[in-house]
């Protein structure tokens, strides 16, 4: 056959679907690889062909579109399973071609099993909710296109294994799950089960996501430098190791980049001709507030180093702060035989 632009295996699209549920999978060519859509391609006389390679096999096979009850079908640029079976797992290829043009891409499809509490190997999306913030909603994801708007599905929401049905702070409202106010106790996995009829059959769509309750922007503050501070003096003798921790608290802010850095005499440590190392550790609170600690270390400090200015800086979307460490050269303790004796007038 003539040359075909092969985009290879698109592993960015690790498609996972539940066993015994409908699945609609769009050909990735039109979403990620080509600059035109299916309608344009179809109008231009291009044909979309589907085939697959079973799990642990090398042989490409055509997809059987003549199964009972049209279990697998194609509609425009969508491959439909009504429903999936476990052995549908494999690599699927969609190819767009005519006599002069050819382009194809493959993608992995994994059909996974779930238990009665919706536990499965499925990778779960994470939805962050602000703590004690007021009304916030999550929407049952990826159910568009499964049924026409004239069909009114029933939707049941679960937290973990349990159906949500009381009027507490989390209230099912059709496709939405409304959090009247979110608390740490609302962290967990939430599942919506959408049930709809089609051609005399009943289908179920199961969608699970993880809710993580995070710090509210109402409570967010600029970075707070806990150390260095005015109460601690770093007093060292030349030759000793100098260790100065810079500990900064950052409020959780969605999509904010938190930064901590040291300057020595106004310059980055890399630009100073001294043997300095900086180690960073990061910890998070339950609401994803962040504490970053950068320890500045000079193994054998010199008297010159003890005269320098050491400043810790921090920045987030809420602002920038800086704090200088108080560093001093330790005055050597007097040696009794000489200094003290002289002091007492000894001869």
């Amino acid at each position: 056959s003539e040359r075909c632009d092969d985009w290879g295996l698109d592993t960015m699209r690790q498609i996972q679907v539940f066993e015994d549920e409908p699945a609609r999978i769009k050909c990735p060519l039109f979403e990620h690889f080509l600059k035109f859509n299916y309608s344009t391609a179809h109008s231009a006389g291009l044909t979309l062909i589907w085939y697959w390679t079973r799990q642990d096999r090398d042989l490409e096979e055509p997809i059987n579109f003549r199964l009972p009850e049209n279990r697998i079908s194609k509609e425009k640029d969508v491959l439909w399973f009504r429903p999936t079976l476990l052995n549908d797992t494999g690599n699927y290829t969609c190819m767009l071609r005519n006599t002069t043009y050819c382009s194809k891409v493959a993608f992995p499809l994994e059909v996974v099993q779930k238990d009665s509490c919706f536990n499965s190997p499925m990778k779960l999306p994470v939805h962050k909710l602000y703590i004690e913030y007021g009304i916030q909603r999550i929407t049952c994801p990826n159910v568009d296109g499964y049924f026409p708007s004239s069909v009114k599905p029933t939707i049941t929401w679960y937290m973990g294994c349990y159906k949500i049905q009381n009027f507490n702070n989390v209230i099912p409202e059709g496709m939405n799950l409304s959090f009247l106010i979110a608390f740490i106790s609302n962290n967990g996995n939430y599942t919506c089960v959408v049930t709809y009829p089609e051609n005399g059959r009943t289908f179920h769509l199961t969608r699970t996501l993880t809710v993580k309750v995070v710090g509210s922007p109402k409570n967010a503050v600029p970075p707070v430098i806990h150390s260095p501070n005015d109460h601690v003096v770093y007093e060292k003798e030349p030759g000793e190791e100098l260790l100065i921790p810079c500990t900064v608290y950052f409020s959780f802010l969605m999509d904010s980049r938190n930064e901590v850095w040291w300057t020595i005499d106004g310059k980055k440590p890399d630009d100073i001709p001294i043997d300095v190392t900086i180690n960073e550790s990061i910890s998070h609170s339950r609401t994803e507030d962040e504490t970053r600690t950068q320890i500045l270390s000079i193994k054998k400090v010199t008297s010159e180093d003890l005269k320098r200015s050491y400043v810790c800086h921090a920045r987030s979307a809420k602002g920038e702060v800086a704090k200088a460490a108080t560093v001093k050269q330790k005055v050597p303790a007097p040696r009794y035989t000489v200094e003290l004796a002289c002091g007492f007038g000894a001869t």
């Epitope: 007021g134 009304i135 009114k152 029933t154 009027f167 209230i171 409202e173 059709g174 939405n176 009247l180």
Partner: antibody
């Protein structure tokens, strides 16, 4: 189309109970909550409580706690509101109304006038 | 005494614009969505606005809603005689228990 049909007007004596019914049609009964709202003559709207027809769970306004009971019969798509220990100030039009909690009450029954008089 | 405060009455001439305010607190309007209802004389209330500013299908775009801080506003442009009615704002509070709250209502008179 969505319809909520309520039972007819009632006249009750103080201390008695009244039970108002609301039959739903035109939608999946268990997919929406049912609110009860009352309106005294010439007054504003007052929320009494809500029932989840799916599981039967309820939440009542503090003012009516202990005096109101909301139930449902899924076989007939009907919800009921019973108010006990009636007093003259309970004279009002009682509405059942379909809706969610956070996105408004989208369909209302025609209302049932309850008159409490000795 | 309603938790949400509305002016008892407003009036305007046909074709004019009118706004109805609804004032609450951080525990109700401040943190939550507001709905608005129209009640024509002798009829049940009808949903006009939900989620602060969304219109159900069939509600003309002459009706609009907005929210700022702990207050909400219903706007009606191109006033018509059939708009003469009572208007109610509604939201909820949750402090360990759910409570749906209505404003006291505003009587709109079309002059």
């Amino acid at each position: 189309q969505v319809q909520l049909v309520q039972s007819g007007a009632e006249v009750k004596k103080p201390g008695a109970s009244v039970k108002v019914s609301c039959k739903a049609s035109g939608y999946t009964f268990t997919s929406y909550y049912m609110h009860w709202v009352r309106q005294a003559p010439g007054q504003g709207l007052e929320w009494m409580g809500i029932i989840n027809p799916s599981g039967g769970s309820t939440s009542y306004a503090q003012k009516f706690q202990g005096r109101v009971t909301m139930t449902r019969d899924t076989s007939t798509s009907t919800v009921y509101m019973e108010l006990s220990s009636l007093r003259s100030e309970d004279t009002a039009v009682y509405y059942c109304a379909r809706g969610f909690v956070t996105s408004g009450i989208d369909y209302w029954g025609q209302g049932t006038l309850v008159t409490v008089s000795s | 005494q309603s938790v949400l405060t509305q002016p008892p009455s407003v009036s305007a001439a046909p074709g004019q614009k009118v706004t109805i305010s609804c004032s609450g607190s951080s525990s109700n309007i401040g943190n939550n969505y507001v709905s608005w209802y129209q009640q024509l004389p002798g009829t049940a209330p009808k949903l006009l606005i939900y989620d602060n500013n969304k219109r159900p299908s069939g509600i003309p775009d002459r009706f609009s809603g907005s929210k700022s801080g702990t207050s909400a506003t219903l706007g009606i442009t191109g006033l018509q005689t059939e708009d003469e009615a009572d208007y109610y704002c509604q939201t909820w509070t949750y402090t360990g228990r759910l409570w749906i709250v209505f404003g006291g209502g505003t009587k709109l008179t079309v002059l």
